[in-house]
């Protein structure tokens, strides 16, 4: 975050930006920036693998839910979107693309369907779905 | 927007931020920044007037929908929230807090209810509601 005060003094600007205001990012152009994470919702339906590839091509990953507080904007997301959560049948755990295990109390897993991938739904719910089913998806990029 | 390239050269940083990446804002701390507008969703239910006062106290206004393209993140908003749209009974028009008239084709107005205020709902819908009914609300701040 570039403190507005710092930027003001640096460039000796006249414009007064309140102390409580700050810049967010950096993010890819036209992505959503929130609490220094970048998010983008993609309208086109792809299977989980294609969605993952699409995010990777943009130097991002599929959505990872790591904090209800830092990601509370996700509460209000309408519809269902691929996130980066996959089921590991060998040990029965759910893990993120980066290999970390899903922590308890972050997501409610809802098993209506056979499948090893999960769709994000509002209020921190994850719906199990067949990985080859086309769905919209959310990419995420953590800022440095 | 502070170009990442500009910031890099300014501070002679090693970290390579792609040309396509940029900063968003400035916004109040922990607000959502998208296409250089700032948004915040408030959980507590207030009537329209209280919601307006809450936004004003944060140097913002209730949500104004001015562009489906620049505000396409609103497509995916779940639930119903006060926005800054009010009905002017004298001429039958709908106008924003800043006095501008609602442009055609921006919102679908749905009259379920008698009222002079409107709730924003996903996919650019506006539900007419009694202004004294408590609801959650969206504040918005346009960046300079």
């Amino acid at each position: 975050i570039w403190s507005a005060v710092f930027l003001n003094s640096l460039f000796n600007q006249e414009v007064q930006i309140p102390l409580t205001e700050s810049y967010c990012g950096p993010c890819p152009k036209n992505w959503i920036c929130y609490k220094n994470n970048c998010y983008q919702f993609f309208d086109e339906s792809k299977n989980w693998y294609e969605s993952q590839a699409s995010c990777m091509s943009q130097n991002a990953s599929l959505l990872k839910v790591y904090s209800k507080e830092d990601q509370d904007l996700l509460k209000l997301v309408k519809s269902y979107h691929w996130m980066g959560l996959v089921h590991i049948p060998t040990n029965g755990s759910w893990q993120w693309e980066d290999g970390s295990i899903l922590s308890p109390n972050l997501l409610t897993i809802i098993e209506m369907q056979k499948g090893d991938c999960a769709l994000y739904a509002s209020s921190f719910k994850g719906y199990i779905e067949n990985c080859s089913t086309p769905n919209t998806y959310i990419c995420m990029q953590r800022t440095v | 927007i502070w170009s990442a390239v500009f910031l890099n050269s300014l501070f002679n940083q090693e970290v390579q931020i792609p040309l396509t990446e940029s900063y968003c804002g400035p916004c109040p701390k922990n607000w959502i920044c998208y296409k250089n507008n700032c948004y915040q969703f408030f959980d507590e239910s207030k009537n329209w007037y209280e919601s307006q006062a809450s936004c004003m106290s944060q140097n913002a206004s209730l949500l104004k929908v001015y562009s489906k393209e620049d505000q396409d993140l609103l497509k995916l908003v779940k639930s119903y929230h006060w926005m800054g749209l009010v009905h002017i009974p004298t001429n039958g028009s709908w106008q924003w807090e800043d006095g501008s008239i609602l442009s055609p084709n921006l919102l679908t107005i749905i009259e379920m209810q008698k009222g002079d205020c409107a709730l924003y709902a996903s996919s650019f819908k506006g539900y007419i509601e009694n202004c004294s009914t408590p609801n959650t609300y969206i504040c918005m701040q346009r960046t300079v």
Partner: antibody, heavy 131, light 106 residues
Framework: EVQLVQSGAEVKKPGATVKISCKVS????????MHWVQQAPGKGLEWMGL????????IYAEKFQGRVTITADTSTDTAYMELSSLRSEDTAVYYC????????????????????????WGQGTTVTVSS | SYELTQPLSVSVALGQTARITCGGN??????VHWYQQKPGQAPVLVIY???NRPSGIPERFSGSNSGNTATLTISRAQAGDEADYYC?????????FGGGTKLTVL
């Protein structure tokens, strides 16, 4: 004994709204989603939607989207289905049904919900729409 | 939207085996549930998740699911099995029922 008891038969005029209740007993209301299913005379079953009583989240069938509102009142252990802008084709029996069970300690200590079918049904409520 | 196809009617001789099919594109990748409904009564779940029986449902009821067809099998059919039978799946965030099959026990 697990029971779902629905409100009585209704006769409504076209354009009106009907609200049916489904009072549960014999289990913890918030541990199962509640579904509503329509059955027109001589026809098959049609799923209308569901509610998670824990947080009020709903999912509606596309056919009924915009006309149906499903709610749950945890203070009275009652689910409701409201159908608006009634037309003659809405003449049917409406069932509430329990399904999707909460398992607080699923694999890896995660909170899980499993769908094992709609295992308990209400007795049905007949709604007649006629002018 | 996803479609489930059931035969309108199936007949079986008393004591014989009845098979009711439910067709759907790649249905084997989905969980299939079966319901029995007798005239004037609410439906009853008889099979869940392809092949599991709820408590109280006789062993004569069994289910299978692979490829494009799910099957409900009722062995040693009894007069009391005469009813409408519906299959059900979850697809695209909606529950879908088949059109129903009327089972007649001769």
């Amino acid at each position: 004994e697990v029971q779902l008891v629905q409100s009585g038969a209704e006769v409504k005029k076209p354009g009106a709204t009907v609200k049916i209740s489904c009072k549960v007993s014999g289990y913890t209301f918030t541990d199962y989603y509640m579904h509503w299913v329509q059955q027109a005379p001589g026809k098959g079953l049609e799923w209308m939607g569901l509610v998670d009583p824990e947080d009020g989240e709903t999912i509606y069938a596309e056919k009924f989207q915009g006309r149906v509102t499903i709610t749950a009142d945890t203070s009275t252990d009652t689910a409701y289905m409201e159908l608006s802008s009634l037309r003659s084709e809405d003449t049917a029996v409406y069932y509430c049904a329990r399904g999707i069970a909460r398992y607080p300690n699923g694999p890896g200590g995660l909170l899980y919900y499993y769908y094992y079918g709609m295992d308990v049904w209400g007795q049905g409520t007949t709604v007649t729409v006629s002018s | 939207s996803y479609e489930l196809t059931q035969p309108l009617s199936v007949s079986v001789a008393l004591g014989q085996t009845a098979r009711i099919t439910c067709g759907g594109n790649n249905i084997g990748s989905k969980n299939v549930h079966w319901y029995q409904q007798k005239p004037g009564q609410a439906p009853v779940l008889v099979i869940y998740r392809d092949s599991n029986r709820p408590s109280g449902i006789p062993e004569r009821f069994s289910g299978s699911n692979s490829g494009n067809t799910a099957t409900l099998t009722i062995s040693r059919a009894q007069a009391g099995d005469e009813a409408d039978y519906y299959c059900q799946v979850w697809d695209s965030f909606a529950f879908v029922f088949g059109g129903g099959t009327k089972l007649t026990v001769l």
